[in-house]
């Protein structure tokens, strides 16, 4: 039902849901720090624009008595409970930041008359696509799917001369929240990825994955999985791998590949890593100093959520427009704003666009190198390394079907 918003007369409030169930196991204190850092920046920007207004955040905590798994499995009702709490207290702000779990976001969107914008650090699943008042500040599954299809079809690069139309997907149910929804999207029979591929099989057991590595009768040379190098090593170990196997390791929110002294372990030589291009200035931030790379992205999304609100607030105030309107609620899309770490672009549906980077391990240097980049905004792949020092024959990616092309 409609809830009155604390969002007028020069005072603008942001409601931040601090849920016990979260896409990443991040101490709520760190998210609070990120939000507060964002508020400081927003206040400064508004002041510089000559707008003398107050912007604050209200942190809404779940009691944690019922919904206490800590991950996203029991998040569905927690979000609605928090909304009820806000409603009872008549404390809704101009914008809602959180939740991050796909289940809770989907349910909250479904069960409420959302006349206010909702900003999420997460909500990766396809079920949260195309929501009119939802903005997602971490790459959703749809963006990954579009990259994969684009890359599979590419056949005009010096290092990839064959279109691919097949794949195995490894999904064993122990994935992190982001990986769970990424792989879920690839598995879904009605998804764009499944529609574009001629053959796709999901491997659910470790043994299935391990057997494929040397199976002469395998139906595809390509295996997609999600996680970090350690996750792959636990699964693959030092097992022999057929020379035309390509493992695509989706590890979007992990900066460890971009640390200067990192050497790629030997088991990564058959692997292409898909990750996000690293930011430039994050390391000096007070909220990110002690965070792991993934958590840095999560906290940064909260901070950028505050900056996005500040950006929209500034535009509407400068135009003399009302904030508590459907127009404001629907405005958080198809724009670029100044994020903490540079410009942030949102697509027509409010989802963040980014540059994805595909890395390979150089057989010469045992270092990670950029093979290509992919701009999610224009759905285009840009080759960077025209003569990669691959482990694969002739330094070209093999065909996806055994027995054809370079083996």
């Amino acid at each position: 039902s409609q809830v009155s918003q604390n969002c007028h007369n020069g005072s603008y409030e942001i409601s931040v849901l601090m849920m016990g169930n979260s896409a990443f196991a991040e101490p709520l204190k760190n998210l609070e720090d990120a939000v507060n850092e964002g508020l400081e920046i927003v206040r400064g920007r508004l002041q510089n624009a000559g707008l003398n207004v107050t912007v604050n955040a209200t942190f809404m905590y779940s009691d944690g008595l019922i919904h206490n798994s800590g991950d996203c499995r029991s998040s569905t009702c927690e979000g609605l409970d928090l909304l009820r709490k806000i409603s009872n207290a008549q404390r809704m702000g101009c914008v809602l930041i959180g939740p991050s779990c796909t289940y809770s976001t989907f349910q909250m969107y479904l069960d409420t008359e959302l006349s206010y914008p909702m900003i999420s650090a997460g909500s990766f699943g396809l079920s949260c696509d195309y929501k009119e008042t939802l903005t997602r500040l971490m790459s959703p599954a749809r963006k990954l799917m579009y990259f994969l299809v684009n890359f599979w079809k590419t056949n005009d690069l010096p290092f990839k001369t064959y279109s691919w139309s097949t794949s195995y997907v490894y999904k064993n149910g122990t994935e992190t929240e982001d990986c769970f929804w990424y792989l879920n999207a690839l598995e879904a029979s009605v998804s764009y990825f499944s529609h574009e591929l001629g053959f796709k099989v999901v491997l659910r057991q470790d043994k299935e994955f391990q057997d494929i590595l040397m199976d002469h009768n395998r139906k595809s040379n390509v295996i997609i999985m999600c996680g970090g190098p350690e996750f792959l090593y636990k699964l693959k170990g030092d097992r022999a791998v057929a020379e035309d196997i390509v493992i695509i390791l989706v590890d979007l929110f992990n900066d460890q590949y971009f640390e200067d002294n990192v050497t790629a372990p030997d088991y990564m030589k058959n692997v292409l890593v898909l990750t996000l291009s690293p930011g430039n200035s994050l390391l000096n931030s007070s909220f990110s100093r002690n965070l792991s790379p993934t958590k840095r992205d999560f906290a940064l999304a909260y901070l950028n959520g505050i900056l996005l609100f500040g950006h929209m607030l500034k535009i509407f105030l400068e135009n003399g427009e009302n904030i508590t309107t459907p127009k404001f609620a629907h405005a958080f899309r198809n724009l670029t704003f100044e994020g903490y770490d540079g410009p942030v672009t949102l697509d027509d549906w409010g989802d963040v666009d980014s540059t994805m980077v595909l890395l390979y391990t150089s057989v010469d240097t045992k270092k990670y190198k950029v093979l290509l980049t992919y701009d999610t905004h224009v759905n285009k792949t840009y080759p960077v390394d025209m003569s990669p020092t691959f482990t694969w024959k002739n330094s070209k990616l093999p065909n996806d079907i055994t027995g054809r092309g370079p083996q």
Epitope: F258, D260, V370, T373, D385
Partner: nanobody, 123 residues
Framework: EVQLVESGGGLVQPGGSLRLSCATS????????IGWFRQAPGKEREGVIC???????KYADSVKGRFTISRDNSKNTLYLQMNSLRAEDTAVYYC?????????????????WGQGTMVTVSS
């Protein structure tokens, strides 16, 4: 001795494309960061794109989405693909190299410079 030689400049209409090359010698591309710079008539030289030694491209906002960089180590050559060219892209384009202290960051300054190649965007 480190050498950089740019080529591929010329006259192109607005909205057109050009590909500049930077042929390098005297060093291994894997150990160097490479930058493309430009200097328009009467203006200061500005950075356009840098490619770190690890191969990570970093773009100036003015060219993002229009210009891309790639390298071919087997030919010791870098390429700057310029699409959707505008009149304000008219400049002398320089290739520059610096021994990399970081594999993923662009250096604050460059030690070696090419002679430049002129790009004119005009109808």
């Amino acid at each position: 001795e480190v050498q950089l030689v740019e080529s591929g400049g010329g006259l192109v209409q607005p909205g057109g494309s050009l590909r500049l090359s930077c042929a390098t010698s005297g060093f291994t591309l894997d150990d160097y960061a490479i930058g493309w710079f430009r200097q328009a008539p009467g203006k200061e030289r500005e950075g356009v794109i840098c490619l770190t030694s690890g191969g990570l491209p970093k773009y100036a906002d003015s060219v993002k989405g229009r210009f891309t960089i790639s390298r071919d180590n087997s030919k010791n050559t870098l390429y700057l693909q310029m699409n959707s060219l505008r009149a304000e892209d008219t400049a002398v384009y320089y290739c520059a190299a610096s021994g990399a202290t970081s594999r993923w960051n662009c250096p604050p300054q460059y030690d070696h410079w090419g002679q430049g190649t002129m790009v004119t965007v005009s109808s």
